[in-house]
């Protein structure tokens, strides 16, 4: 899915109002020094691509994130604010349902959610190399096409 046409401000609002708090709850009890972020993103569509991948794609050692509250809210936000996103996720949803019945928090999952928090931080405030313009948001407050 191409996230270029999402309403980034609305997704950001959804993240800050609820998703961020759910991520903090998930990570509660984890030392803030424990994990170093290794996944990064360069602009908002790229950040959403990485966020989707880490949130919904089962990985070795962590197959259960898609059933977490933050994941369900992320899915809802993307479905509402990214045109055509829902249609692309039907097959993925079926696979997700088969993937795992129970929720299990492993150290690998905690590391993955730490990575997610970092990706959301960059989504909320893209930090781009300056080439002429120093803006990191377009005038319409929605789309982001700069690749500095």
């Amino acid at each position: 899915y191409d996230f270029t046409n999402c309403d980034f401000e609305k997704i950001k609002a959804a993240y800050l109002s609820t998703i961020s708090k759910d991520l903090i709850t998930y990570m509660s009890g984890t030392k803030s020094t424990e994990f170093n972020n290794t996944v990064s993103c360069s602009n908002r569509p790229h950040c959403l691509t990485e966020i989707q991948s880490l949130t919904f794609n089962p990985t070795a050692g962590c197959a259960s994130l898609a059933k977490e509250m933050f994941a369900m809210k992320t899915k809802a936000a993307l479905a509402i604010w990214c045109p055509g996103y829902s249609e692309t996720q039907i097959n993925a949803t079926q696979a997700m349902k088969k993937a795992r019945k129970s929720k299990v928090t492993t150290n690998k999952c905690l590391e993955q959610v730490s990575q997610l928090q970092g990706l959301w931080r960059r989504f909320n405030r893209p930090l781009l190399k300056q080439q002429g313009s120093s803006d990191y948001k377009d005038d319409d407050d929605k789309h982001h096409h700069h690749h500095h």
């Epitope: 020094t33 994990f35 170093n36 972020n37 928090q117 120093s134 407050d141």
Partner: antibody, heavy 119, light 107 residues
Amino acid sequence: EVQLVQSGAEVKKPGSSVKVSCKASGYAFSNYLIEWVRQAPGQGLEWIGVIDPGNGDTNYNENFKGRATLTADKSTSTAYMELSSLRSEDTAVYYCAREDNTGTAFDYWGQGTTVTVSS
Amino acid sequence: SIVMTQTPLSLSVTPGQPASISCKASQSVSSDVTWYLQKPGQSPQLLIYYVSNHYTGVPDRFSGSGYGTDFTLKISRVEAEDVGVYYCQQHHRFPLTFGQGTKLEIK
């Protein structure tokens, strides 16, 4: 406990350079942006720039472009702000600050470093 | 760059009474506004982020509101410990910019 500890006060001559350090502890240094802000005597806050210690990416206020250089040393969890071609108007308290967990604010600040530029 | 204009620049309030600080942006900054308090002789401290979200440990007598260009920080009942300079900040566009500050004193 998250802490940002800055280097001590500096007195510099016009035209020279100053390098202020900001040592971070209590969190994964590479994961959070470090911001630099200054405050001239009796004045408000002015944003200098920001660095991502994880990859070295920076963004500068145009007012400081070419004079300010932000760097970070992951091995010592220390961020640096170097300001060159100093003039008397650069006399200020220089702060480093960390972005918060959402990336929308500065939640921890250093104690500030006073830089005085005088001939 | 976006100019953030605060009013008033100073205010004197009786303990227990409300206080309100306005911050106007020269162009829309969506909801990307943060409020800081700098107490005398201290570094700034975070109060409110993304217009209305309380930072950890900030009393609920502080509240933020607004969208676009007009923002307000309200203190429902001012206490002696609230003295200092309040700054609004936009992080919608680089360079990030602050308001000029509002000094709150206790009567």
